[in-house]
Each structure stands twice: as structure tokens, then as C-alpha cells.
Amino acid sequence: MNGRVDYLVTEEEINLTRGPSGLGFNIVGGTDQQYVSNDSGIYVSRIKENGAAALDGRLQEGDKILSVNGQDLKNLLHQDAVDLFRNAGYAVSLRVQHRLQVQNGPIGHRGEGDPSG
């Protein structure tokens, strides 16, 4: 019998300084691009090598970004979210939700709709 897979959800404030090539990550999600079932949130899909986010080290693929400089990312179209990041200025504060997989029992599996999959 499979063990149950639970998730430990934590939030973190990450302050990034925009580098020469920007913030250094990609996003998916939005009300018109649901990446996770029944969730129109914005998720990190790629951390660029040697970019600002990678050098900081805290932002991870699969993280959900809740806000940028205090502005909520709920109910945004995908391109509007992209534009929000692009216009966020030099110092960028991200409120991020990390979701860590915690396995209970002998066999775990990644759930359908897991953003890190």
C-alpha cells in the first residue's frame, strides 16, 4: 500500500536586487494559464543559471509567488503578471510560498498538479 504524501507549506520574504540581466527566473500561471488544477496562482518554472535569483539561492522552481513589492498576484492574467515583474524596479520584494514534500509511509508519489513536476 502506498504511503500518503503530505506537503509542508512555508512562506518567506525574498528581497532580490535586479542584476544586469534582470531577476533571472521564469513563471507560469495566471487566470488564463492555470498551471496547477483549480489554482490561477503564479509559479516559478525556471531559475536561470547565474541570474539574480540563482545567486541569492532562496527562490526555487515550483515556488508560488504570492506578491511582488506588496502587490498581490491573485487573479492576474499571465502577461499582466509578467509585466508586473518587469516593471517592479531595482529592488524587488517577493512573498513566496515553498511547498516541501513530506512522505508518510514507505512509498511516495508526486501528486497530479504538483508544480515542481
Epitope: G24, F25, N26, V28, R46, H78, Q79, V82, R86
Partner: nanobody
């Protein structure tokens, strides 16, 4: 991991047409930013066209002749190539990355993409 497989290449006469396809694995194809590059023997890899969530981009050399498109239901991107010229002869390679960059997008920069296909040969004879 995303796998990309190109098809549709071949030999065509100048002035003719071809349609290339790039089929991708993965359940979130609609979120991919995708591009076509080409490489002729002894030359650098050259950007051809790209398609993002918000629009399309073309190299000046193919503008008005080539059209990039996608069918999310089929996990496939296309390159319709019309009015082909001998100088279009090359291996055509598709590239992809998951999501949209939050930085300024440079479609012709290979570092924008994480995944690459093996390519399909296009030969245009005069």
C-alpha cells in the same frame, strides 16, 4: 524533462513550401515558450522564429515568408515556410523553455531555452 521531436523536413525547389512540426512531451505544453533555430554547414546557429504566450517573433531574413504557430491540444509547434530560397537550406532545430521570463525576452538568445530537439534537414535546390 521535456523532449522535442522535429519532423517535416525534406528537399524542395526554390519558391516551394514546407511545414515543419515540433512535438513536445509534457502536460503543460501551453505554457512553453518555443522557438525555431537553424544551422547551415560551417555556420553559426541562427534564430528563425519564436512563439510566446503573448506573441510571435521573426528573424528579418524570414519575415513575411515563414509563419510560426502552435496547437496546444496536439502538443505541437509548426513552422510554415513559403517562398523558400537556397539560403534557407539548413538543419532546423526547435527549442523550448517552460514559462515566460520575467526579464526582457531575447528570442534569438539560445540561453533563453532549456530544451533542444535533434533537428530536421531542409534542403532548397535552385
Amino acid at each position: 524533462h521535456v523532449q522535442l521531436v522535429e519532423s517535416g523536413g525534406g528537399l524542395v525547389q526554390a519558391g516551394g513550401s514546407l511545414r515543419l512540426s515540433c512535438t513536445a512531451s509534457g502536460r503543460t505544453f501551453s505554457t512553453y515558450t518555443m522557438a525555431w533555430f537553424r544551422q547551415a554547414p560551417g555556420k553559426e546557429r541562427e534564430f528563425v522564429a519564436a512563439i510566446t504566450w503573448s506573441g510571435t517573433y521573426y528573424a528579418d531574413s524570414v519575415k513575411g515568408r515563414f509563419t510560426i504557430s502552435r496547437d496546444n491540444a496536439k502538443n505541437t509547434m509548426y513552422l510554415q515556410m513559403n517562398s523558400l530560397k537556397p539560403e534557407d537550406t539548413a538543419v532546423y532545430i526547435c527549442a523550448a523553455v517552460i514559462g515566460s521570463t520575467v526579464d526582457s525576452y531575447s528570442p534569438s538568445d539560445p540561453l533563453e531555452y532549456d530544451y533542444w530537439g535533434q533537428g530536421t534537414q531542409v534542403t532548397v535546390s535552385s
